[in-house]
């Protein structure tokens, strides 16, 4: 069991504990910031990011950003709490296993965002249709 | 009954070495990812590293990354966590913690073992 000395420590955001009492391990992400990307016009894409971080706060969940302007397209992976707003931007997927993009509006570019918590889910990105939980089929499907 | 029980702490120069261990048993370790955490005084946890099941994959803490690394060895149900390059900002107490496959929670910590880092 956890020793109890560390659940009597300092009350911080760094533990975070289920009604047990028992310490949420931090998930672990992709983590490249913001990287040139050449996914376009695909149903989903891998991160191609080589760096896997152990997200600093239990309490974070996988980001992934993918923006496209004039000049370029660009992927952003990174560790983030669902409870502030990332990009001006609610995290209301947050608790889903896979990153399925959703189209955001911003002026001048089209941008998507996902979140999710599993292991390295920001990795596989998804711009799929059929994972859209916006598709009232699969609502159907997830609630009955 | 699970068990583990870190060792290999104590005082250490700025810039020196250290090799903690966690021995382990009461379960099948090799099925369970392991982790280092510490906490130091009066601060809460830190999340240092991890290492999957069969030790193919490594996971750092930034704080760390370059100077630690976790490697377990399952015939001896061991981990280990190698520190180089110590700082004083690495005195902690360390502990080592199991998670289950599929669990988001720690189910079993050892009682940890205290590295002091002074000049």
């Known amino acids: 069991t956890i020793p109890p000395h560390v659940q009597k420590s300092v009350n911080n955001d760094m533990i975070v504990t289920d009604n047990n009492g028992a310490v949420k391990f931090p998930q672990l992400c992709k983590f490249c910031d913001v990287r040139f990307s050449t996914c376009d016009n695909q149903k989903s894409c891998m991160s191609n990011c080589s760096i896997t971080s152990i997200c600093e706060k239990p309490q974070e969940v996988c980001v992934a950003v993918w923006r496209k302007n004039d000049e370029n397209i660009t992927l952003e992976t990174v560790c983030h709490d669902p409870k502030l707003p990332y990009h001006d931007f609610i995290l209301e997927d947050a608790a889903s296993p896979k990153c399925i993009m959703k189209e955001k509006k911003k002026p001048g570019e089209t941008f998507f965002m996902c979140s999710c918590s599993s292991d390295e889910c920001n990795d596989n990105i998804i711009f799929s249709e059929e994972y859209n939980t916006s598709n009232p089929d699969l609502l159907l499907v997830i609630f009955q | 009954e699970v068990q583990l029980l870190e060792s290999g702490g104590g005082l250490v120069q700025p810039g020196g070495s250290l090799r903690l261990s966690c021995a382990a048993s009461?379960?099948?370790?090799?099925?369970?990812r392991m982790w280092w955490v510490r906490q130091a005084p009066g601060k809460g946890l830190e999340w240092v590293s991890?290492?999957?099941?069969?030790?193919?994959?490594?996971y750092y803490a930034d704080s760390v990354k370059g100077r630690f690394t976790i490697s377990r060895d399952n015939s001896k149900n061991t981990l280990y966590l190698q520190m180089n390059s110590l700082r004083a900002e690495d005195t902690a107490v360390y502990y080592c913690?199991?998670?289950?496959?599929?669990?988001?929670?720690?189910?079993?910590w050892g009682q940890g073992t205290l590295v002091t880092v002074s000049s």
């Open positions: 009461g379960f099948t370790f090799a099925e369970d």
């Open positions: 991890a290492i999957d099941p069969q030790g193919q994959h490594t």
């Open positions: 913690a199991k998670q289950s496959t599929g669990s988001a929670t720690s189910d079993y």
